[in-house]
């Protein structure tokens, strides 16, 4: 069997949601000694980086300027040291968003609620898609999907403090090209005293995943690379 | 807003060399990444060089060794040095850069590309 390296790892910079026309940055972290790194987009080529020197750097940056839904879709990575190839790495999906129109949300019965009562989230968008996302802040990973003409429906069933937080919805023109967000609707959930004061609150701030871990090695930084080789076995 | 303007496409024997340039307009030539692609009659637009912000190079592997990119920052112009020119080499070539671009990214695919030329045309026959 041909021999191949470990397949790297492929990240967002901050996120994966890239409203149109700003830059999406994506990592692709491989191995010390790379001498080149591609950029695959929906199984073609797009972008080579050749880093300088490569025994000094585990990865690379892409950048993708002014992002449309030409740019949109399902990116992978490859990296060669001398003559061998990694695998490929695993995909990722690149959105776009702020596309065309601005979707409402709402919930019912109401944004103040108590633990174990139903609620239903509704996204309404009055312009031409029939897929609805909803997503939670600081969880853009998990995003719920539903469908309808103009509105869709998201029932959460019975709902305890993990459901507190912020949420937005967008209205989908494909898997890739998503509307602007819509206006965000803060979920009160409240239980009894000790489960209140005890649920923790999600993080408002981007997904920890979403960032770009690469390292430049200097003469001193032998003891980084070890523990990065260790890392990345572990992962693997 | 870029504007890019190709010149030096023209008739050429087989064999023979030719090269193209591609004038830019605007400061941000020297944080540009630049391209090469090319058009031939009923076929689809493709790759055939590309060039980063530091020089770094590559080629579509039928270009390879015969074509060179080149660019001179000082004169915004990106040039296509080619030769050995064969009969498939026949096409509409045009120019596109990536605008702004960071790091030393070398871009491939037609859709990283957001200003492009208007062509020159290039004929290889007898």
């Known amino acids: 069997p041909k021999q191949t390296l470990p397949k790297p790892i492929i990240r967002a910079e901050s996120t994966y949601m890239v409203p149109k026309e700003k830059q999406a940055t994506l990592c692709c972290q491989g191995s010390y000694g790379a001498v080149e790194y591609q950029l695959h987009f929906e199984g073609s080529l797009f972008a080579v980086e050749r880093p300088k020197p490569p025994e000094r750097i585990n990865g690379v940056k892409f950048h993708i300027p002014d992002m449309n839904s030409r740019k949109a879709g399902r990116y992978s990575c490859i990296y060669r040291v001398g003559e061998l190839w990694s695998e490929r790495s695993d995909l990722l999906d690149l959105v776009v968003t702020e596309m065309y129109d601005t979707p409402t949300l709402s919930v019912h019965p109401g944004p103040e609620v108590t633990s174990g009562e139903k609620v239903t989230f509704y996204c309404r968008l009055d312009t031409a898609t029939s897929m609805f996302l909803l997503l939670k802040e600081g969880r853009s990973r998990d995003v719920q999907r539903s469908y309808g003409k103009v509105q869709a429906e998201f029932p959460m069933g019975p709902v305890t403090t993990a459901h507190r937080g912020s949420y937005r919805c967008f209205g989908s023109y494909n898997n890739y090209a998503w509307s602007f967000p819509s206006e965000p609707v803060k979920l009160l959930v409240t239980g009894d005293i000790e489960n209140t004061s005890l649920a923790p609150t999600d993080p408002t701030f981007p997904d920890s995943w979403d960032t770009c871990l690469l390292t430049r090695e200097t003469g001193l930084q032998k003891d980084l690379a070890l523990w990065d080789h260790t890392a990345q076995n572990l992962l693997r | 807003e870029v504007q890019l303007v190709e010149s030096g496409g023209g008739e050429v024997q087989p064999g023979g060399s030719l090269r193209l340039s591609c004038a830019a307009s605007g400061r941000t030539f020297a944080s540009a990444a630049m391209g090469w692609f090319r058009q031939a009659p009923g076929k689809e637009r493709e790759f055939v060089a590309a060039?980063?912000?530091?020089?770094?190079?590559y080629y579509a592997e039928s270009v390879k060794g015969r074509f060179t990119i080149s660019r001179d920052n000082a004169k915004n112009t990106l040039y296509l040095q080619m030769s050995s020119l064969r009969a498939e080499d026949t096409a509409v070539y045009y120019c596109?850069?990536?605008?702004?671009?960071?790091?030393?990214?070398?871009?491939?695919?037609?859709?990283?590309?957001?200003?492009w030329g208007q062509g020159t045309l290039v004929t290889v026959k007898p």
């Open positions: 060039i980063s912000r530091s020089d770094d190079t």
């Open positions: 596109a850069a990536v605008v702004p671009t960071y790091g030393n990214n070398i871009y491939v695919h037609s859709a990283a590309y957001n200003y």
